[in-house]
């Protein structure tokens, strides 16, 4: 069954945590649907964003942070492992110095920590996708 | 009650027709939600687009056409009559030489016909909105 989109969940992250998302683009790539995953510093959607991950399907991925209300330096990738019309599995792992983003089991993007991952309080998944799975796994100490 | 998004409906347009849409952005303007309305030449979403109207709430509006699979010259407007968090009523009227877009009763955008409005077979409303009303009215002859 489908999860609501935008999908918002409280989360605490640290090194070893992984966020897993399964979904499908709602439109063909020609129409440039988007997927966005935002790691927020508060439960409010207007809060700062520790890690902003936005896919324009078929075109590009941009990653950024929003600090004290201002977007910072954008990182862009043309790598496009997503398939038109196909379900995807996205996993974002918290490594000691960066986020590692896997798409369908393949390491596809990295983003250096700009803010401590421990500052994350909420994850939001939204834009032009249907969502079937959202999970945050924690490394067992 | 809410209509599904993306929302797709068969439509035939000509001078005097009006498409009316009521909805609400799904996110605060700081997060730049989008609204998109596309007038297609076929019932298929990958078909050409006679009139493409895309709002990046709080930032800008772009209008364009997609002909034989290729986007043409984009028209951009910084006019932003939409209100953060507020419901909007959008009406797109087919005038003899252009589309006129009204937002909450106020004339806000125009777009010259590049393709005959009679070529429209389907309207799609999508992206980051909840949709409560969609209507196509036809001028009584």
């Amino acid at each position: 069954s489908l999860l609501p989109v935008p999908y918002t969940e409280a989360a605490s992250l640290s090194t070893g945590s992984t966020v897993t998302i399964k979904g499908r683009p709602l439109a063909c790539f020609l129409n440039e649907p988007y997927l966005q995953v935002d790691f927020h510093t508060e439960m409010k959607e207007e809060s700062d964003i520790v890690f902003h991950f936005q896919v324009c399907f078929g075109r590009r991925v941009v990653m950024n942070s929003r600090e004290y209300g201002a977007w910072k330096q954008q990182v862009e990738s043309k790598n496009m492992p997503f398939q038109d019309g196909q379900e995807f599995e996205l996993s974002i792992s918290v490594l000691p110095d960066k986020y590692q983003v896997m798409v369908n089991g393949q390491s596809s993007y990295t983003f250096d920590h700009r803010i401590k991952p421990e500052a994350v309080k909420m994850v939001q998944v939204w834009r032009d996708i249907s969502l079937t799975k959202f999970n945050v796994s924690y490394l067992k100490r | 009650s809410l209509l599904p998004v993306p929302y797709t409906e068969a439509a035939s347009l000509s001078t005097g027709s009006t498409v009316t849409i009521k909805g609400r952005p799904l996110a605060c303007f700081l997060n730049e939600p989008y609204l998109q309305v596309d007038f297609h030449t076929e019932m298929k979403e990958e078909s050409d687009i006679v009139f493409h109207f895309q709002v990046c709430f709080g930032r800008r509006v772009v209008m364009n056409s997609r002909e034989y699979g290729a986007w043409k010259q984009q028209v951009e407007s910084k006019n932003m009559p939409f209100q953060d968090g507020q419901e909007f009523e959008l009406s797109i009227s087919v005038l003899p030489d252009k589309y006129q877009v009204m937002v909450n009763g106020q004339s806000s955008y125009t777009f010259d016909h590049r393709i005959k409005p009679e070529a429209v077979k389907m309207v799609q409303v999508w992206r980051d909105i909840s949709l409560t009303k969609f209507n196509v009215s036809y001028l009584k002859r």
């Epitope: 510093t41 942070s65 600090e67 910072k72 330096q73 110095d97 250096d112 920590h113 700009r114 803010i115 401590k116 421990e118 500052a119 | -």
Partner: antibody, heavy 124, light 107 residues
């Protein structure tokens, strides 16, 4: 052992210019962001500027914006600081520093290697 | 821009524990780093990422942070630890900031 060796300091009149250089060795220079930090006589440390590993992104303390330019030549393993419109308050020892870790544009993990510094004196 | 505030001087008896604080940073978000500087020498990184020690730094140096305060702790202070200590913080995309420095006297 990582080495950072600054040069180019000296006495200059107010309004004058200087170009500092920092020769780096014994590490992969092109992989790390680099910074300049200064210390006025008898005072504390003040961060001046940072440049990312590729040289495409720079950041400056407000007091030097528009007057100082940080740059790097990865082929020569050298960091530069072009200082124009110098003021007496720019008088300091200028240290070249390497960022800790592989972060692309950051001093957030600290600066793990420092040069011995070069003295810049701005006086008439 | 934020300002980092340190006490100008801290004294500790030989073999006792010294704590130097650094206030004013958003240490819930950004890491604290600490440097030791002896007279006439360049600074040396002694703690990074709040609590990590570079190789070669004695175990008696440790760090922590909470809220707007970072703390450098020297357990069993030695005579050679008498130095100036500076905290530093900053984000990836913005300015780095140093505290004003603290002189540690070992009595």
């Amino acid at each position: 052992q990582v080495q950072l060796v600054e040069s180019g300091g000296g006495l200059v009149q107010p309004g004058g210019s200087l170009r500092l250089s920092c020769a780096a060795s014994e590490f992969t220079f092109s992989r790390y962001s680099m910074s300049w930090v200064r210390q006025a006589p008898g005072k504390g440390l003040e961060w001046v500027s940072t440049i990312n590993s590729g040289g495409g992104s720079t950041s400056y303390v407000d007091s030097v914006k528009g007057r100082f330019t940080i740059s790097r030549d990865n082929a020569k393993n050298t960091l530069y600081l072009q200082m124009n419109s110098l003021k007496p308050e720019d008088t300091a020892v200028y240290y070249c520093t390497k960022s800790q870790g592989g972060i692309s544009f950051s001093t957030q993990y600290g600066m793990d290697y420092w040069g011995k510094g070069t003295l810049v004196t701005v006086s008439s | 821009n934020f300002m980092l505030t340190q006490p100008s001087a801290v004294s500790v008896s030989l073999g006792q524990t010294a704590r130097i604080t650094c206030q004013g940073g958003n240490f819930g978000r950004y890491y604290a780093n600490w440097y030791q500087q002896k007279p006439g020498q360049a600074p040396v990184l002694v703690i990074y990422k709040d609590s990590e020690r570079p190789s070669g730094i004695p175990e008696r140096f440790s760090g922590s942070s909470s809220g707007d305060t970072a703390t450098l702790t020297i357990s069993g202070a030695q005579a050679e630890d008498e130095s100036d200590y500076y905290c530093q913080s900053g984000s990836v995309s913005d300015n780095a900031v140093f505290g004003g420095g603290t002189h540690l006297a070992v009595l």
